[in-house]
Interface confidence: medium
């Protein structure tokens, strides 16, 4: 299947130009998406190009500015949040990034009713997290690891927690490992639907070992960054969940929610919290050995002012072939009766599907089925359930949006997106207004992305929100590479791959091949999405063929493929990349003397192991910020897939799967090792140990570090990185500069 057909005929080719590295580094061909900031069933906010905050009413067709760029600019605001009663807007400035999701900022509250900033009882700075209640204009915020509550923006704050301490106790915000590997958010507090209660997590990191690294900065002495970071097998954070009545916060104070007994008996995690009603909450817990998850539904007892979590409302999810869930354990979507819910988990055939749980998990009703996977439940209304899946035409790398009519019997299923813009759009996500009255579809490709607005009842398209016309025009004279997505059938395993081919690709010629790999558990690289990036340039300008392959351990093709890597990371992912390369060589257009592999993070680990596989297939390769030993990486992530690094568990494979153990095998390849010294995620330690092992084995290699850069290698480092890698590959492939 050719996803991006050549745009032009040969007669026009002389007016066309290839992509340049500069195009990529400048983001010349980046695209825009439009996600409405829904504030009701038919209204949304959007920040206009000139930075006014505009309210759109779909039904009246009217729009007006609720906050001007002038006011935004007066406090250098880069973000905003409207209170649900529409009386106030918080303006966020002085953004200072911390980890992947977390940042601190200064907040100003603008009073729309008075047309002025709220004066008196101003918020402290910098704030770690701030949010409005779901109804009205109460404020909850986290400052110096403690939670505060304001009944109104101008009121004095009520302090909810007092034990917060940097790097020790975190209230309402996650510590490093919960942020990165469990919650995937900057916050750990949750308002009940009408703002009566506020739930929050407290993380105790007192006994967690600390990773310390130098941050060089500009001073005479570097400073040391200290982060409580549990590596595999280390002491983990201890978590507790509390709920406070925000109407009378001082009355009983925060009440702790009990942990299910079967979870509390050993080390455990809290994985998510979902409010059902103001007086019913659902918590999800996970054993440290992450194959058992418990969903617990708790109710408020007015007479005792406590939260009760009866055993009859505990639902256990267990995996016998791998870990619980996909990347994370899925979260429930409750129906209107406030007790039954919809949830995605593995069916008896080992495919992730939507189930309806009324009383027990054993009696769950399967809503979707087939040799494909349901990926996300977007919204459940009284008569419809909207979800995404990769069912259509059996392409795992696609995403279409479906509607199941749950009000009718039998429930009827309709693909909302499959035939909308079939060539252009095969990978969608959606954003729904209240009660799914309207929704936005955001199509990511394979053609140029487009965002559209739809009627939630009829699915009729109302208008185009963003179609990237400027991008389309800019690409008219660019020779883009061709892309195709196909599959290889090898030993009962299906290996989907994406191949990016030079614009004038000729099967009778030989091309250098670059494998781009990620390959981490529950990831997917072969997706029908639009991208003009570094590898597009390598194909367009430098005439390389680039391939991405989804091997064992990758997602959305069933548990057999996903859980194949359980307790054995670093084996099958590498084997499958090598198998694919051999198949590509058999296709006849690959120069087998010029094959390279590169990857970042988990991909850096896989590319390193592939280079050190001793197959002789790869001439060279690059590892950016690689993991080199699973003992160096975070407990929550690593143990999910590898178990514990103890003798009676999986220590042997922890030791066997390191890059360092294969140092000798790098002797006959050109290896470029790259890492940021301030990487809080995959610590520089990983590359330091690879380098040490290579030096000890007297193996020559190339390396580049990026001072004070984290796992993302952003800013000017990005330009330097891609320029450096380009030179390395061109040298490897004997391509002239």
């Amino acid at each position: 299947i050719v996803l991006r057909p050549p745009r032009v005929h040969n007669s026009e080719e002389n007016t066309m130009r290839a992509l340049t590295l500069k195009d990529i580094l400048n983001g010349t061909f980046s695209y825009k998406t439009f996600f409405p900031n829904w504030i009701s069933g038919q209204e949304y906010l959007h920040q206009s190009a000139d930075n006014n905050i505009v309210l759109y009413n779909i039904e009246t067709g009217q729009s007006y500015t609720i906050l001007s760029n002038r006011t935004m600019k007066s406090v250098n605001a880069s973000n905003y949040g409207l209170s649900p009663d529409r009386q106030f807007v918080y303006l966020e400035s002085d953004y200072s990034k911390l980890w992947r999701y977390s940042y601190t900022a200064t907040y100003y509250i603008y009073d729309l009713s008075n047309g002025e900033f709220v004066r008196g009882n101003e918020l402290p700075r910098p704030i770690q997290y701030l949010c409005w209640s779901p109804v009205g204009s109460k404020l909850a915020y986290v400052y110096q690891n403690n939670i505060y509550l304001k009944q109104r923006p101008g009121d004095p704050p009520f302090q909810i927690t007092f034990n917060g301490r940097e790097n020790k106790i975190f209230n309402g915000i996650p510590d490093w490992v919960y942020e990165e590997e469990m919650l995937a958010t900057k916050y750990a507090l949750w308002w009940s639907p009408n703002g009566k209660f506020l739930a929050y997590a407290e993380f105790n990191d007192t006994d967690i070992p600390v990773i310390a690294y130098s941050y060089y900065g500009d001073e005479q002495y570097p400073r040391t960054i200290n982060i409580p970071y549990p590596k595999a097998g280390a002491k983990n954070p201890f978590v507790r969940i509390f709920i406070i009545d925000t109407t009378y916060p001082a009355y009983v104070g925060p009440q702790e929610v009990p942990v299910p007994a079967m979870i509390a008996s050993s080390d455990y995690y809290f994985s998510w919290l979902t409010w059902v009603t103001d007086e019913r909450v659902c918590l999800q817990w996970l054993k440290r050995v992450q194959n058992v998850s418990v969903l617990s539904i708790c109710d408020f007892r007015e007479d005792w002012q406590t939260w009760d979590c009866p055993k009859t409302q505990e639902h256990i999810e267990e995996s016998r072939t791998g870990w619980a869930g996909g990347f994370f354990v899925s979260t429930p979507v409750f129906s209107y009766d406030a007790i039954s819910y919809y949830k995605i988990f593995s069916d008896k055939d080992g495919y992730k599907h939507i189930h309806y749980i009324k009383d027990t998990v054993e009696n769950a009703i399967q809503i979707t089925s087939g040799k494909w996977e349901a990926i996300n439940i977007f919204r459940v209304t009284q008569d419809s359930l909207f979800y995404s899946s990769n069912e259509f035409e059996d392409y795992p790398g696609r995403r279409n949006i479906y509607r199941i009519s749950i009000g009718s019997y039998p429930p009827s299923k309709k693909c909302v997106t499959c035939h909308l813009r079939k060539e252009r759009c095969q990978y969608y996500t959606a954003s729904f207004s209240d009660y799914a009255k309207y929704y936005a579809l955001v199509c990511y490709g394979p053609g140029i992305p487009i965002s559209t607005l739809h009627d939630g009842r009829t699915d009729q398209e109302i208008k185009i929100l963003e179609e990237n016309k400027e991008l389309e025009n800019a690409l008219k004279n660019i020779q883009l590479p061709k892309e195709e997505i196909k599959k290889l059938e090898v030993d009962e395993i299906t290996l989907w791959y994406k191949m990016i081919l030079p614009p004038q690709f000729d099967r009778s010629k030989k091309y250098p091949l670059l494998i781009q790999v990620y390959g981490g558990p529950c990831s997917q690289s072969v997706r029908s999405v639009f991208a003009v990036n570094w590898i597009s340039y390598l194909a367009s300008k430098e005439g390389m063929v680039i391939a991405l392959v989804d091997g064992r351990g990758t997602a959305f093709q069933g548990d057999k493929l996903l859980y194949a890597v359980y307790r054995k990371l670093g084996v099958y992912e590498v084997e499958d990349q090598i198998t694919a390369v051999r198949k590509f060589i058999e296709m006849g257009f690959i120069d087998e003397k010029r094959i390279a592999i590169w990857g970042w993070s988990y991909g850096g680990y896989v590319s390193s192991l592939a280079l050190a596989s001793g197959t002789g297939l790869f001439k060279c390769g690059i590892a950016v910020a690689p993991v080199s030993s699973w003992e160096y990486y975070a407990s929550v992530y690593t143990e999910r897939f590898m178990g514990l690094p103890t003798k009676d568990d999986n220590l042997e494979h922890y030791k066997n799967s390191t890059v360092m153990a294969r140092a000798e095998y790098f002797r006959n390849v050109d290896y470029l090792l790259i890492h940021g010294t301030a990487d809080d995620n995959v610590h520089f330690q990983n590359s330091a140990q690879i380098a040490k092992a290579l030096v000890n084995a007297q193996v020559d290699f190339q390396a580049m570090w990026y001072s004070d850069q984290n796992h993302g290698l952003s800013g000017l480092s990005t330009n330097h990185l891609y320029t450096h890698m380009t030179h390395f590959l061109k040298q490897c492939f004997s391509l002239s500069d």
Partner: antibody, heavy 121, light 107 residues
């Protein structure tokens, strides 16, 4: 029903004082800024004074600065305009109005019926 | 202060006519422009806010447009109850200022 009712108008001599009141009902009074607007006989509308929801912030038109003081009692849902050193040119119908919330450029969405102030010797 | 200038000062029209009133600001006021209707002896009534948004309860024959400095109020089909004086008002900056008014009379 949302409404504003002004009172306190009447005849006053130049240099004299008058206090206008505006009773609000049907909405959360303390959440909204309020204004006074006047209209001289046969003329257009002229903004006079405004006050924030909390009452902590007021501002006046240059023509009345130092002479008129606007205040509010949120516990009584009442708005006031204290007018001192009155002049003949202050003769007008005085309206109180509510400033709409929900967006920054708030319009005046609810108006009272007006009260006539006549300054004459 | 921002000056608001309305034109015409007055106009005569018949029932069913399409009527257009313009309002010009002395500097850009974005879309922070409101229109009011006032009948003799009555308080003003909000018709249009934020240049083009119809206030709830106002008939759809009234519409507003414009941004920056030039704005228009249109009555698509004049009804007997529409004979009144119309005022524009900017809420971009303090003090809020009104136009001098446009009187719509029966022809």
């Amino acid at each position: 029903e949302v409404q504003l009712v002004e009172s306190g108008g009447g005849l006053v001599q130049p240099g004299g004082s008058l206090r206008l009141s505006c009773a609000a009902s049907g909405f959360t009074f303390s959440s909204y800024a309020m204004i006074w607007v006047r209209q001289a006989p046969g003329k257009g509308l002229e903004w006079v004074s405004a006050i924030s929801g909390s009452g902590g912030y007021t501002f006046n038109a240059d023509s009345v600065k130092g002479r008129f003081t606007m205040s509010r009692d949120n516990s009584k849902n009442t708005l006031y305009l204290q007018m001192n050193s009155l002049r003949a040119e202050d003769t007008a119908v005085y309206y109180c109005a509510k400033r709409d919330g929900g967006y920054e450029g708030g319009a005046f969405d609810i108006w009272g019926q007006g009260t006539l102030v006549t300054v004459s010797s | 202060d921002i000056q608001m200038t309305q034109s015409p000062s007055s106009l005569s029209a018949s029932v069913g006519d399409r009527v257009t009133i313009t309002c010009r600001a002395s500097q850009s006021i974005s879309s922070y422009l409101n229109w009011y209707q006032q009948k003799p002896g009555k308080a003003p009534k909000l018709l249009i806010y934020a240049a083009s948004s119809l206030q709830s309860g106002v008939p759809s024959r009234f519409s507003g447009s414009g941004s920056g400095t030039d704005f228009t109020l249109t009555i698509s089909s004049l009804q007997p109850e529409d004979f009144a004086t119309y005022y524009c008002q900017q809420s971009y900056s303090t003090p809020p200022t009104f136009g001098q008014g446009t009187k719509v009379e029966i022809k």
